[in-house]
Interface confidence: low
């Protein structure tokens, strides 16, 4: 009740707790290494509160420091498959605007079939994050195996 | 400025920063793949502020979006052991109430002896999280190698 | 109760959203397994808001529960290299003050070339975190491959 009262003066949203958790929609056509994401409760447990999707890529709507996290699992994969198809690499970066293009987080699969990591990074309104999976193996679309998200942490 | 004003009506606790970090207590009996957790300052650096343990499983007490994270290291393990005992898989999911049962996060060990990941997910009061380790290898109980936690992020 | 009262006078910063994200500066001399970190906007996307660096190690300035995260990638590494040089292990712990010395998080590389994990842990003002990399392989200094950070979560 006290919480609701305070909300009348200051909606929680103004604290800037932007957050998103996405599930894999599809991979790009050949020559496009990007993973295309989707989100929304109708799809399962994914959501966007603040950030938005722009053609399957995540666009930031509030300046701040964000925790970016990702897990990608390769489909139909064993350690033998993974090593035979090495290098398979996942990179998360700012791909737009071009002036701010930079790789934020990069991992190779080596003999594993899953990578998972997270990091803190400053992001600005309008930054679009792309996730590039290079190599011949395809990612699993299972929502508990492959996901990508951001969480606003502070201004 | 507006934030400071709102704080006059709203103490931090009501924001609901529920958080828990657990250490492994024991594995289940045969046919029960669940890991059983424990937490509390007397045990070391584990704690529960909001969520509770119910027979070694973590029960959520506040609706919201949570960051769920886990690391599990297999005991007496080398990459040879891990590959020989493949598949060894760790899954985190809502196991109760049954109507909300779903796998949230899943990883296989392949040739590694540690898995670690994290994700954002909506959880509701009463949700119980279970961590299922399937396979014949046992997890390490070292508190810096195996741990499981949640952090409330926003409503 | 005292916290709620203090909030009435204190701006957002007083909530203690201390946060830091560091990039690798250099490894230590022989017999010193510690990684030495650096941070600041001039270096790229690393930063310190609250915590400080003390001779390349991260010192905490505010009591609370923190999310600690790390990713370390080995340089010039393949799964063959990693397994040949096993064990290569990364440990994050409180190394000072000596009375609070403890390992918080530990991972081995086995046949992989990257480790990444995160955990919640209570830290106190004055705690210094050290990251020890044991083994003969060297870490990559690429800022998207090796990084270390903390985020204050709650009192």
């Amino acid at each position: 009740q006290r919480f609701a009262q305070a909300q009348q003066q200051l909606p929680l949203e103004s604290l800037g707790w932007d957050v998103a958790e996405l599930q894999l929609n599809h991979t790009g056509p050949q020559q496009d290494p990007r993973l295309y994401w989707q989100g929304g409760p109708a799809l399962g447990r994914s959501f966007l509160h603040g950030p938005e999707l722009d053609k399957g890529q995540l666009r930031i709507h509030r300046d701040g420091i964000y925790m970016v996290h990702i897990q990608v699992t390769l489909a139909i994969c064993s350690s033998t498959t993974a090593s035979r198809h090495h290098p398979t690499t996942l990179a998360v970066g700012i791909c737009s605007p071009a002036s701010r293009s930079i790789s934020l987080l990069r991992l190779s699969f080596h003999q594993g079939c899953t990578i998972a990591s997270q990091r803190l990074t400053p992001l600005a309104r309008g930054d679009t994050l792309c996730t590039n999976l290079t190599g011949t193996l395809l990612p699993s679309r299972n929502t508990d195996e492959t996901f990508f998200g951001v969480q606003w942490v502070r201004p | 400025q507006r934030f400071a004003q709102a704080q006059q009506q709203l103490p931090l606790e009501s924001l609901g920063w529920d958080v828990a970090e657990l250490q492994l207590n024991h594995t289940g009996p045969q046919q029960d793949p669940r890991l059983y957790w424990q937490g509390g300052p007397a045990l070391g650096r584990s704690f529960l502020h909001g969520p509770e343990l119910d027979k070694g499983q973590l029960r959520i007490h506040r609706d919201g979006i949570y960051m769920v994270h886990i690391q599990v290291t297999l005991a007496i393990c080398s990459s040879t052991t891990a590959s020989r005992h493949h598949p060894t898989t760790l899954a985190v999911g809502i196991c109760s109430p049954a109507s909300r049962s779903i796998s949230l996060l899943r990883l296989s060990f392949h040739q590694g002896c540690t898995i670690a990941s994290q994700r954002l997910t909506p959880l509701a009061r009463g949700d119980t999280l279970c961590t299922n380790l399937t396979g014949t290898l046992l997890p390490s109980r070292n508190t810096d190698e195996t741990f499981f936690g949640v952090q409330w992020v926003r409503p | 109760q005292r916290f709620a009262q203090a909030q009435q006078q204190l701006p957002l910063e007083s909530l203690g959203w201390d946060v830091a994200e560091l990039q690798l500066n250099h490894t230590g001399p022989q017999q010193d397994p510690r990684l030495y970190w650096q941070g600041g906007p001039a270096l790229g996307r690393s930063f310190l808001h609250g915590p400080e660096l003390d001779k390349g190690q991260l010192r905490i300035h505010r009591d609370g529960i923190y999310m600690v995260h790390i990713q370390v990638t080995l340089a010039i590494c393949s799964s063959t290299t990693a397994s040949r040089h096993h064990p290569t292990t990364l440990a994050v712990g409180i190394c000072s003050p000596a009375s609070r010395s403890i390992s918080l998080l530990r991972l081995s590389f086995h046949q992989g070339c990257t480790i990444a994990s995160q955990r919640l842990t209570p830290l106190a003002r004055g705690d210094t975190l050290c990251t020890n990399l044991t083994g003969t392989l060297l870490p990559s200094r690429n800022t998207d491959e090796t990084f270390f950070g903390v985020q204050w979560v709650r009192p």
């Epitope: 909606p11 799809l43 959501f47 | - | -």
Partner: antibody, heavy 123, light 107 residues
């Protein structure tokens, strides 16, 4: 109870700018839980989505209208507005404002609509 | 843009009978489809979202099904208040688009 109310001139001359306002009552326009949309319906025809604005002022427009559309928000008045420039007779339609809920239920669907306002473009 | 095609354009049904309305998308929508009802001189009303979930307060006689590119709205037993125009809408991609509508009239 949330209500949306469109207002603005019912008649606009060709080549001029159509301006409409939607007043939101019963909810804060600053909530991240919602998007605020404009949709139109020419007489006897189907519905066409024009565009939307979020609490932060970020907008998405229908590409077919993008060059002529501006949607803005006035949080102090709990209103959002539509401006459509260089109008022609084909812009004659009933214009609706609608809320899109994007938080746990009915994602990206229009759950609350205004009653609509008829705008005729004629000299 | 995703083109939504509804059929038939007009459906003549007697009260108490079942009505089946179709909506086809030019590309897969997963389940990101909604149905609306519009009566003369009124704003549309949300009936179904997520292809099959009834919105709050919508009677059980309305049901949605389908996924991908083919979707169906079924009204199991038409009541007098159900005679209206029905629109499908996709929210899988930009721009958000509606179908041309199906008019359900009294036979």
């Amino acid at each position: 109870q949330l209500q949306l109310q469109e207002s603005g001139p019912g008649l606009v001359k060709p080549s001029e700018t159509l301006s409409l306002t939607c007043t939101v009552s019963g909810a804060s326009i600053t909530s991240t839980s919602y998007y605020w949309n404009w949709i139109r319906q020419p007489p006897g025809k189907g519905l066409e989505w024009i565009g939307r604005i979020s609490y932060s002022g970020s907008t998405y427009y229908n590409p077919s209208l993008k060059s002529r559309v501006t949607i803005s928000v006035d949080t102090s008045k709990n209103q959002f507005s539509l401006k459509l420039s260089s109008v022609t007779a084909t812009d004659t339609a009933v214009y609706y404002c609608a809320r899109q809920i994007r938080y746990n239920w009915n994602p990206d669907t229009f759950d609350i609509w205004g009653q609509g306002t008829m705008v005729t473009v004629s000299s | 843009e995703i083109v939504m095609t509804q059929s038939p354009a007009t459906l003549s049904v007697s009260p108490g009978e079942r009505a089946t309305l179709s909506c086809r998308a030019s590309q897969s929508l997963n389940s990101n489809l909604a149905w609306y009802q519009q009566k003369p001189a009124q704003a549309p009303r949300l009936l179904i979202y997520g292809a099959s979930t009834r919105a709050t307060g919508i009677p059980a006689r309305f049901s949605g099904s389908g996924s991908g590119t083919e979707f169906t709205l079924t009204i199991s037993s038409l009541q007098s208040e159900d005679f209206a125009v029905y629109y499908c809408q996709q929210y899988d991609n930009w721009p958000l688009t509606f179908g041309g509508g199906t008019k359900v009239e009294i036979k």
